[in-house]
Every structure is written in structure tokens, then in C-alpha cells.
Interface confidence: medium
């Protein structure tokens, strides 16, 4: 599986899950978020050559197609599969307000 | 929606579902296939700038993460939502065979 | 460069039947289509039928269906359209054309065309 | 078979003029659609694919739009070059149909 487990061990050039770390004020500028100031929320990237991670059959299609015609600019690509929730900690007035934002961390990619 | 109704209709650059003719026997060496000789597979491709059809929290995140690091290798790809199956023809041995291959045909896409 | 380049002009009697050829070079034949389109004098253009010469996979249409042979050598890269039982209306530049890789049917490259006169 | 019925069958316009042919199938071939130029004696020579797709090496006063039932083949700015017949071809289904063609001619 092109998962954080397999991924982040090896120097892996075609899709899987890359580390990203968001820093909420500073690269998104949401200021509203108390706790946690950032956090890993990974990205998918990479090249799918034919029948790495297909997602369907018309990913599986479409890179063979890619690999016959390499000039032709369609091509499946790399997304995220498995993603997990993040909780924060935000304030409404005085109030602390605790919620879990869902498909926040990407654990594995795909190629779709 | 970034279906084949608005994106054939519209010279849109942003991600969109694209025409894609597949041959079969040139495109992709399937000789076996009998009926139809090709089949419209289509195929998503176009940036996916922030909050267009973004499909997770995710998404929505690295769009944003990406339009205020625009430097950054990290952004979301436009890739198939909507699948439709494609019936074919082929022969095992003189024995015709009627088989529906699902998730053949790209409808619409989103960013991912 | 990819070329297509056709037999020469026929004169044929009705009834009869007539071998066009188109020979292929500059790409590999054996995987691309190749398609038979026709012009009668002063006419426009019509499609008449198609091979693959990886597998000598045919389609035709209707209208041509049973009078009309499309085969493919591949060791010479030659592509022949026969058309049997010709009446004066077969009278028509005949063209091969190559389908356009990465594309459906747009035809990329065409033969110089070959004219047949059925006449008695 | 699907009809491809094309118009006008032919036109004059002055060298500059913004030429327009128009191409109506008969049912939906989304947006599979070729356009051809042919002078006489000549082949056809491929000009747009895919409805508004320009070939390689067409000059950009060719254009080409459309989806479904209904398409446009433009010539910007008419050259005397430009003198010929132009034919539309549905590659959507097979028998690949072509319509009957419009002969551009300068004023």
C-alpha cells in the first residue's frame, strides 16, 4: 500500500504519500485556530505508471494508454485513498470549542 | 458540475472532464475485445485553484495551502468522480461473451 | 514522414471487380487503422470501410457491405480495398487515409487518391 | 447512420472576411467532430479534431466549436489560400459519415 508506513521509508519516485506539515496561521492564515498550530497534513505526489495503485478500471486503462502513447497528455494521477480526521481547539467568544475536522491527514495515496 | 455536459461544451482550463477516444486494438492492444472497436473513456486534466469541486477537507486545505504558497510542489489533482460501466463483445473460443467492465468512462471529475 | 502512396488510375466494365492499393511507410503500419474514403465526380466525400492490419480487424459500411474486401499485407505494408460488382455510379477518386493517433477517426494522412472509371 | 448535414453548400466573401460553415448532426456525437479542407485535385487535409482541436501546423484563423447536434468551422480572416471545399466528418460511430461539404470562393 502507498501508505505513510511504506512511503516515508523509502525515497520512492512514482505516487505516494509525501510528508507536509500546514502551519495554520502562517500558511493558511486561520487565526481562529487555537490548538494544534499546525499539523502533518500530508500530500499525494508522484508519476502512476501503469497499474501502480489503480483505483479503477479506467485508471488501469488510461495508463496502459499512457504507456503506448507517451505523448498524450492524459495519464492517471496520484490523490490521496485514506485520509483521518484532525481535532482542534478553536474559541467562540471566551468559549473553547472542541471539533474533529474530518478527511484532514492524508495516510495513503492512489492513482486515479 | 465538471461533468461532460459543461466541460465539452466550455474552453475551460481548470480541471474538467476532456474527450478521450481509446482504440482498443491501437490504443491499447486489446485484440481480444470484438465489440465496440473503441469507447469514449475521457479523462480529467486541469489545475485545480482553491475550492473548485474540491472533493475533502483536504483538498479544500491544500488548494488554499497552495494558492498562498504558490511556490510550494504540494496541490490537489483533478481526477474522475463520476464512473459509467462499458458493455463489450469478445469471443472464448467461437463462444460469444457479453461483459459489462465497470468504471470505464469518465463523467465528471473534482479536485482531489 | 508518413506517407501514403495509392496504385494507379483503373478503367474497369461494369460488372467487374477493381484492387486499389495503398502502400504505408514512415510509421508502424500494423498499428494504426487505415480507411477507405471515396469522391464521385463533382461529389462529396464518403466513408467506406476500414482495417486494422495488426489483426486484419474490418468494419464496413452498410451500404458497401458484401461488395466491398479491405485487406492488409502487413510484410509489404500494404493496405487493398477491392470493390466487386461495379456499376458506373463506383465511378470515384478512391483515397486511403491513416486514423490519426490519439484520436478517434480525424484521418491525419491520405493517399493521392485513385480514380476508377467503371465504364462499358 | 448518423446524417451530418452541412451549410451553406457554398459562399463568396472578400480577402479579411470572417467566413462561418456550420455542421448538424443528425443525433449527439458529443464533440466528435473533424473538419477537412480539400482543393481540387488535391486530398483532403486534415484542419480541426475534436470539434475545436486545431491540427498541427493549421493556422490559427482556423477554428472550430461545438458539442452534441451542433457545429461551427470559422475562417477569422478569409486568404486567398483559403479557396477550397470544406467538409465536416463525425468520428463518433461508425459508418464515419461526412457532410456534404461548402465551397469557399473570393468576391
Known amino acids: 500500500a502507498l501508505d505513510t508506513n511504506y512511503c516515508f521509508r523509502n525515497l520512492e519516485e512514482n505516487c505516494c504519500v509525501r510528508p507536509l506539515y500546514i502551519d495554520f496561521r502562517q500558511d493558511l492564515g486561520w487565526k481562529w485556530v487555537h490548538e494544534p498550530k499546525g499539523y502533518y497534513a500530508n500530500f499525494c505526489s508522484g508519476p502512476c505508471p501503469y497499474l501502480r495503485s489503480a483505483d479503477t478500471t479506467h485508471s488501469t486503462v488510461l495508463g496502459l494508454y499512457n504507456t503506448l502513447n507517451p505523448e498524450a497528455s492524459a495519464s492517471p494521477c496520484c490523490v490521496p485513498q485514506d485520509l483521518e480526521p484532525l481535532t482542534i481547539l478553536y474559541y467562540v467568544g471566551r468559549t473553547p470549542k472542541v471539533e474533529q475536522l474530518s478527511n484532514m491527514v492524508v495516510k495513503s495515496c492512489k492513482c486515479s | 458540475a465538471l461533468d461532460t455536459n459543461y466541460c465539452f461544451r466550455n474552453l475551460e482550463e481548470n480541471c474538467c472532464v476532456r474527450p478521450l477516444y481509446i482504440d482498443f486494438r491501437q490504443d491499447l492492444g486489446w485484440k481480444w475485445v470484438h465489440e465496440p472497436k473503441g469507447y469514449y473513456a475521457n479523462f480529467c486534466s486541469g489545475p485545480c485553484p482553491y475550492l473548485r469541486s474540491a472533493d475533502t477537507t483536504h483538498s479544500t486545505v491544500l488548494g488554499l495551502y497552495n494558492t498562498l504558497n504558490p511556490e510550494a510542489s504540494a496541490s490537489p489533482c483533478c481526477v474522475p468522480q463520476d464512473l459509467e460501466p462499458l458493455t463489450i463483445l469478445y469471443y472464448v473460443g467461437r463462444t460469444p461473451k457479453v461483459e459489462q467492465l465497470s468504471n470505464m468512462v469518465v463523467k465528471s471529475c473534482k479536485c482531489s | 514522414q508518413v506517407q501514403l502512396v495509392q496504385s494507379g488510375a483503373e478503367v474497369k466494365k461494369p460488372g467487374s471487380s477493381v484492387k486499389v492499393s495503398c502502400k504505408a511507410s514512415g510509421y508502424t503500419f500494423s498499428s494504426s487503422w487505415i480507411h477507405w474514403v471515396r469522391q464521385a465526380p463533382g461529389q462529396g466525400l464518403e466513408w467506406i470501410g476500414r482495417?486494422?492490419?495488426?489483426?486484419?480487424?474490418?468494419d464496413y459500411s452498410e451500404k458497401f457491405q458484401g461488395r466491398v474486401t479491405i485487406t492488409a499485407d502487413k510484410s509489404t505494408s500494404t493496405a487493398y480495398m477491392e470493390l466487386s460488382s461495379l456499376r458506373s455510379e463506383d465511378t470515384a477518386v478512391y483515397y486511403c487515409?491513416?486514423?490519426?493517433?490519439?484520436?478517434?477517426?480525424?484521418?491525419?494522412?491520405w493517399g493521392q487518391g485513385t480514380l476508377v472509371t467503371v465504364s462499358s | 447512420d448518423i446524417q451530418m448535414t452541412q451549410s451553406p453548400s457554398s459562399l463568396s466573401a472578400s480577402v479579411g472576411d470572417r467566413v462561418t460553415i456550420t455542421c448538424k448532426a443528425s443525433?449527439?456525437?458529443?464533440?466528435?467532430v473533424a473538419w477537412y479542407q480539400q482543393k481540387p485535385g488535391k486530398a483532403p487535409k486534415l484542419l480541426i479534431y475534436y470539434a475545436s482541436n486545431r491540427y498541427t501546423g493549421v493556422p490559427d484563423r482556423f477554428s472550430g466549436s461545438g458539442y452534441g447536434t451542433d457545429f461551427t468551422f470559422t475562417i477569422s480572416s478569409l486568404q486567398a489560400e483559403d479557396v477550397a471545399v470544406y467538409y465536416c466528418q463525425q468520428d463518433y460511430s461508425s459508418p464515419y459519415t461526412f457532410g456534404g461539404g461548402t465551397k469557399v470562393e473570393i468576391k
Open positions: 482495417i486494422y492490419p495488426g489483426d486484419g480487424d474490418t
Open positions: 487515409a491513416r486514423r490519426m493517433i490519439t484520436t478517434q477517426a480525424a484521418l491525419d494522412y
Open positions: 443525433q449527439s456525437v458529443i464533440n466528435a
